[in-house]
């Protein structure tokens, strides 16, 4: 008998090379075979459970950056007046959540902020829990 | 043929809103359907393996806080004279281990320390390993 | 019918008690039943996917330390002029990658650096993905 295989784990790595002041960061998924999807500049959560979240990047100017998942809830990450980020966190997310950036710069310029090495990774930690597609 | 489902991963999120000087933090599990249990103010480990551990909180006064798992072993986390914590770690835990807090304040008052956003998450990283219930 | 069990997750914990200047750290796997292997002082990657990586240690002198996985690629971790490390990261690794240390000290002596509590943990986060043995 063939031993059971794992169904694919919900995970995604998105990249971002620029962020817009008072908006967010433009995210793209470099791989075609990710198990999670990007829609309207947000990562769509289909499965309930804990997620491991890794966020990295170097910014062309000082900014304040937050990563949200649900209207009316506090951010997953919130960094004030930084020029880089290299953080890891764990959070409980659920079906219908959407993970997206909010960015504010402290300059009078309205130019985009350039990002080097901008990377956001989400990895589901509770396979076997509720999912809806 | 239906693809195999994952059995639930051992994981838990506990909250704590107060800590007692020279004792620990009073932990409660807000969800009924956690796959790990709280007993005598400790999280009970049933499965051997690596665990992802996330610890967060803001404290009403300066304290020293350690998170233990086994008598005679060093702490999983140890923070000296802090007013907040936001840490992630990885540790190998085993059946019969119990994860619990120890707290010391540096004030002459014996009042409880109030905690805002106090959260401890454990997520088993080695399903398929030894478990005993 | 017996519910399906998880096949073992690819994971390993290696220890290191000394590092050689302009070389690396001598790693040993204390457990016989690890699901990943050490070869030529490197951890061999057999499975594609995200890995949770934990790195800890206290050094007998100041050093610069990098953790690499592939020739021509940037390091997984890079620490400059430190006496200790306690870091967690997430990275995408693939079959044929090898995880290894590079160390530089800033003294004119060529003695080994002694390490206390030196530990490197890798845990695969995408079971069900491609593996080759």
């Amino acid at each position: 008998q063939v031993p059971p295989q794992y169904p694919p784990i919900q995970s995604i790595r998105v990249q971002f090379t620029r962020c817009e002041n008072e908006k967010g960061c433009i995210i793209t998924s470099p791989s075609k075979d990710e198990t999670m999807k990007v829609q309207d500049n947000s990562i769509i959560i289909n499965c309930d459970g804990f997620y491991l979240i890794s966020l990295k990047g170097y910014f062309s100017e000082e900014l304040s950056l937050s990563l949200y998942y649900r209207k009316g809830r506090g951010p997953l990450f919130s960094l004030s007046k930084v020029t880089s980020v290299d953080s890891i966190g764990v959070a409980y997310l659920a079906f219908k959540d959407k993970v997206y950036f909010n960015v504010t710069t402290h300059s009078t310029s309205y130019k985009d902020i350039q990002v080097n090495g901008g990377e956001l990774i989400l990895i589901h930690q509770n396979p076997g829990g509720f999912c809806a597609y | 043929q239906v693809p195999p489902q994952y059995p639930p991963i051992q994981s838990i999120r506990v909250q704590f809103t107060r800590c007692e000087n020279e004792k620990g933090c009073i932990i409660t599990s807000p969800s009924k359907d956690e796959t790990m249990k709280v007993q005598d103010n400790s999280i009970i480990i049933n499965c051997d393996g690596f665990y992802l551990i996330s610890l967060k909180g803001y404290f009403s006064e300066e304290l020293s806080l350690s998170l233990y798992y086994r008598k005679g072993r060093g702490p999983l986390f140890s923070l000296s004279k802090v007013t907040s914590v936001d840490s992630i770690g990885v540790a190998y835990l085993a059946f019969k281990d119990k994860v619990y807090f120890n707290v010391t304040t540096h004030s002459t008052s014996y009042k409880d320390i109030q905690v805002n956003g106090g959260e401890l998450i454990l997520i088993h990283q080695n399903p398929g390993g030894f478990c005993a219930y | 019918q017996v519910p399906p069990q998880y096949p073992p997750i690819q994971s390993i914990r290696v220890q290191f008690t000394r590092c050689e200047n302009e070389k690396g750290c001598i790693i040993t796997s204390p457990s016989k039943d690890e699901t990943m292997k050490v070869q030529d002082n490197s951890i061999i990657i057999n499975c594609d996917g995200f890995y949770l990586i934990s790195l800890k240690g206290y050094f007998s002198e100041e050093l610069s330390l990098s953790l690499y996985y592939r020739k021509g690629r940037g390091p997984l971790f890079s620490l400059s002029k430190v006496t200790s490390v306690d870091s967690i990261g997430v990275a995408y690794l693939a079959f044929k990658d090898k995880v290894y240390f590079n160390v530089t000290t800033h003294s004119t002596s060529y003695k080994d650096i002694q390490v206390n509590g030196g530990e490197l943990i890798l845990i695969h986060q995408n079971p069900g993905g491609f593996c080759a043995y």
Partner: antibody, heavy 120, light 106 residues
């Protein structure tokens, strides 16, 4: 500039207690192992106790184990030595010493010392 | 535990070269520090990691370490160098000292 300033030395009776302190400045205190070393009058240097950079790991010479406790407060940049059940033979100048790393025992800077006298 | 052996005293003529030895089992595999203590003063590290001089230590002080012997050399000793000299190594997280050598400058 690097400084280590010890205090707390005094004249004390046998079986008494003292707490020595060492305030550090001029370097990242939390990154380095620290030690206490003593020197009895007219004698050589003697390692007393050491503590690694974040305080998890401590070492003691055999004849002070169970009587002396080394500790540190990285936020206050202060090293401590709690000395209980003091003996006449503990009389010495006590020096606070910085290590080259977070662990290891290789010294690179000494304080000026604080004098402990145990006498009835 | 690990032991370090030093000669109790060494004499040197003014502006001549003095050698102070420190013996220990395979001491060459360990880092050696040399500590100077002028009478009535606190100890000062004059050589660390076998042969490195801290800022402000004169060039006449040098160190070497191999096999079972570490050596402190004072090239052109001056009257102000008259002091006690201790070798020191780290050993399994603790620290070990030699018994000390008193240098007399004649």
């Amino acid at each position: 500039e690097l400084h280590l300033v010890e205090s707390g030395g005094d004249l004390v009776k046998p079986a008494g207690s003292l707490r020595l302190s060492c305030v550090a400045s001029g370097f990242t205190f939390s990154s380095f192992r620290m030690s206490w070393v003593r020197q009895s009058p007219g004698k050589g240097l003697q390692f007393v106790a050491g503590i690694n950079s974040d305080g998890y790991n401590t070492q003691y010479r055999d004849d002070v184990k169970g009587r002396f406790t080394i500790s540190r407060d990285n936020t206050e940049k202060t090293l401590y030595l709690q000395m209980n059940n003091l003996r006449v033979e503990d009389t010495a100048m006590y020096y606070c010493v910085k290590d080259q790393g977070s662990w290891g025992g290789n010294f690179d800077f000494w304080g000026q010392g604080t004098l402990v006298t145990v006498s009835s | 535990s690990y032991g370090l052996t030093q000669p109790p005293s060494v004499n040197v003529t003014l502006r001549e070269t003095a050698h102070i030895t420190c013996g220990g089992d395979s001491i060459g595999s360990k880092y050696v520090q040399w500590i100077q203590q002028i009478p009535g003063q606190a100890p000062v590290v004059i050589i660390y990691k076998d042969r490195n001089r801290p800022t402000g230590i004169p060039e006449r002080f040098s160190g070497a370490n191999s096999g079972n012997t570490a050596t402190l050399t004072i090239s052109g000793a001056l009257a102000e160098d008259e002091a006690d000299y201790y070798c020191q190594v780290g050993d399994s997280g603790t620290s070990v000292f030699g018994g000390g050598t008193h240098l007399t400058v004649l």
